[in-house]
Interface confidence: low
């Protein structure tokens, strides 16, 4: 039984108080167990050696369960995805008890927190997944999925985190509810990727020879691993791996009086291989001395008459096209001719007399090796 | 013709010294990175060190870095590798290496020079 | 370091056999590959480079492939002469040669 006391206070005429107290003895109306514990919440705990669950009752009081099933507030020794039923009571309740159904959860390791970034966006996305790598007979209707990743929470299996900071790191907790009881969670601190470095600043890009060409840069700011420097003349392309440490690089056995347009990107090898974007230049190497004419012929056209022809160079190296033709009797030069093209006609030389007949290119800097042939003019025949 | 000719091989004891060098010819050197790569008897090809054309990079492996230092002479045409506290394990055939591309395409080697350590 | 991983470490052949031998590095090397033949008692001679680039004066019977991680030397009719030693080089990042493929007469 429980007492409600009803009090009055008067104040007597000597100023004294006189109390008069009238009370009623009541029986008040203890909650019946099934209503106090109506709401009641359960959490379950994994037991990964025996692969069953402890259901711990989140009560204050220490409750009795039905056949002495609970101790300390907990139920041990459940099979995932089976039903128990326990009896809770109290003494600060009534009849008729608590009927609590348990249902068991699935084994927790029958889950898996999956990293599901694709590593080409990783630099900037998160994806986290929970996975179910074995079955369970329990109903995947009743399973839900929470995360929290900073102040943002999700009611998902899945998540993706986009727009983030690469090279970053990024904490995500969550959890997996049966019924809407917790029976696992998982925290994941994951580091976004390295990002795509920066654009390289080229200082100057240059030929000062024929064969050689130099390019000095400053590295991007972002992280990176080496460079790519690829140089195109015409169609042909060729790459290089730089090493991250270099600022400056030589060009060599570059082809004389050509443009070469250069591309110079840093990359990082990550998850994948992210290349950052491309500094871009070009120069001319300077002319070179031409290869040597080729295929020369030298031809009795009469007596005294020669045709001298010869194919142009392989190499020019250089911006014009003119050809020329020393003829030589002895050590003595007799003819110095220039052509556009590499046909002359040599007249009026002397019977019977060893020629020597030199032929070469000239780029216009530079004359090409010549070629050289020895032809003697005949009798003449009248 | 290009041609890479190695020399200053031998015997040394552990713990012992020698300087290799490679007198190259038919081709511009000073246009080139070269290296050397060893091959121990009965073994595989090993990378030991290479240098830039200029000389202003330098790269090694851990096993010889600190112990071998490659060097060149442009004037000389000539390539050295000196090696310093050799162990059992530096016994192999050296060869000097010419690299056609940057830092690949080894397409001129040495004959070798053959490198005994031993006690 | 990377590695590489040069697989068969021998094979038998026959003198017209397609022969394929390949290399795996442990990380990309984007291309940065070389392929090497020697035979007993000579230094070794450049067949490829940059994966698939023949050599000068290397027969057309040599071919290489590859990207990213994985790369493979085909010799398309194997001759006489080509019973030899095969390595691959990396050099991407610093140079790891492949562990060699000998090829023997079956």
């Known amino acids: 039984a429980y007492l409600n006391a009803s009090e009055t206070t008067t104040l007597s005429p000597s100023g004294s108080a006189v109390i008069s107290t009238t009370t009623i003895a009541t029986t008040p109306s203890k909650p019946t167990c099934d209503e106090k514990y109506a709401n009641i919440t359960v959490d379950y705990l994994y037991n990964k050696e025996t692969k069953l669950f402890t259901a711990k009752l989140n009560v204050n009081e220490n409750v009795e369960c039905g056949n002495n099933t609970c101790t300390n507030n907990e139920v041990h020794n459940l099979t995932e995805c089976k039903n128990a039923s326990v009896s809770i009571s109290h003494n600060s309740c009534t009849a008729p008890d608590k009927t609590l159904i348990l249902d068991v959860p699935p084994g927790v390791e029958k889950f898996q927190l999956h990293d599901c970034t694709q590593v080409e966006k990783a630099d900037t996305t998160i994806c986290l997944k929970w996975k179910n790598i074995e079955t369970f007979t329990c109903d995947t209707q009743n399973i839900t999925y929470r995360f929290q990743c900073g102040n943002m929470i999700f009611d998902n299996k899945e998540i993706k985190l986009e727009n983030l900071e690469p090279e970053h790191e990024y904490k995500c907790d969550s959890e997996i509810l049966y019924n809407n009881h917790k029976f696992t969670n998982a925290s994941k601190i994951i580091k976004t990727d390295f990002g795509s470095p920066g654009e390289p600043q080229i200082i100057f890009c240059r030929s000062e020879a024929a064969h050689q060409g130099v390019i000095t840069w400053n590295p991007p700011q972002r992280s990176f691993h080496n460079f790519t420097l690829c140089y195109i003349k015409e169609t042909e392309k060729d790459c290089l791996n730089l090493d991250k440490n270099l600022i400056k690089y030589d060009l060599q056995n570059l082809k004389p009086y050509t443009k070469y347009v250069l591309s110079l990107h840093a990359y990082i090898i990550a998850k994948v291989q992210r290349n950052g974007s491309a500094a871009m230049c070009h120069f001319t190497t300077k002319s070179a001395p031409p290869s040597q004419v080729w295929n020369m012929t030298v031809s009795m056209t009469s007596d005294n008459s020669m045709h001298v022809k010869c194919r142009p160079p392989r190499d020019r190296n250089g911006p014009h096209e003119r050809y020329h033709l020393e003829v030589e009797a002895g050590n003595t030069l007799v003819r110095n001719e220039s052509h556009k093209n590499c046909d002359f006609r040599v007249k009026d030389l002397q019977y019977s007399t060893d020629y020597t007949f030199k032929a070469y290119f000239h780029n216009g800097d530079y004359p090409g090796e010549p070629f050289i042939l020895h032809h003697s003019t005949s009798y003449n025949s009248k | 013709e290009v041609q890479l000719v190695e020399s200053g091989g031998g015997l040394v004891q552990p713990g012992g010294s020698l300087r290799l060098s490679c007198a190259a010819s038919?081709?511009?050197?000073?246009?080139?990175?070269m290296a050397w790569i060893r091959q121990a008897p009965g073994k595989g090809l090993e990378w030991v060190a290479s240098?830039?054309?200029?000389?202003?990079?330098?790269y090694y492996p851990d096993s010889v870095k600190d112990r071998f230092t490659i060097s060149r002479d442009n004037s000389k045409n000539t390539l050295y590798l000196q090696m310093n506290s050799l162990r059992a394990e530096d016994t192999a055939v050296y060869y000097c290496?010419?690299?056609?591309?940057?830092?690949?395409?080894?397409?001129?080697w040495g004959q070798g020079t053959l490198v005994t350590v031993s006690s | 370091d990377i590695q590489m991983t040069q697989s068969p470490s021998s094979l038998s052949a026959s003198v017209g056999d397609r022969v394929t031998i390949t290399c795996k590095a442990s990380?990309?090397?984007?291309?940065?590959l070389d392929w090497y033949q020697q035979k007993p008692g000579k230094a070794p001679k450049l067949l490829i480079h940059?994966?698939?680039n023949l050599h000068t004066g290397i027969p057309s019977r040599f071919s290489g492939s590859g990207s990213g991680t994985d790369y493979t030397l085909t010799i398309s009719s194997l001759q006489p002469e080509d019973f030899a030693t095969y390595y691959c080089?990396?050099?991407?990042?610093?140079?790891?040669f492949g562990g060699g493929t000998k090829v023997e007469i079956k």
């Open positions: 290496v010419k690299f056609h591309h940057y830092s690949g395409g080894g397409d001129a």
């Open positions: 038919g081709f511009t050197f000073t246009n080139f990175w």
């Open positions: 240098i830039s054309s200029s000389g202003g990079s330098i």
């Open positions: 990380q990309n090397i984007n291309k940065y």
């Open positions: 940059y994966t698939n």
């Open positions: 080089l990396q050099h991407s990042s610093r140079w790891t």
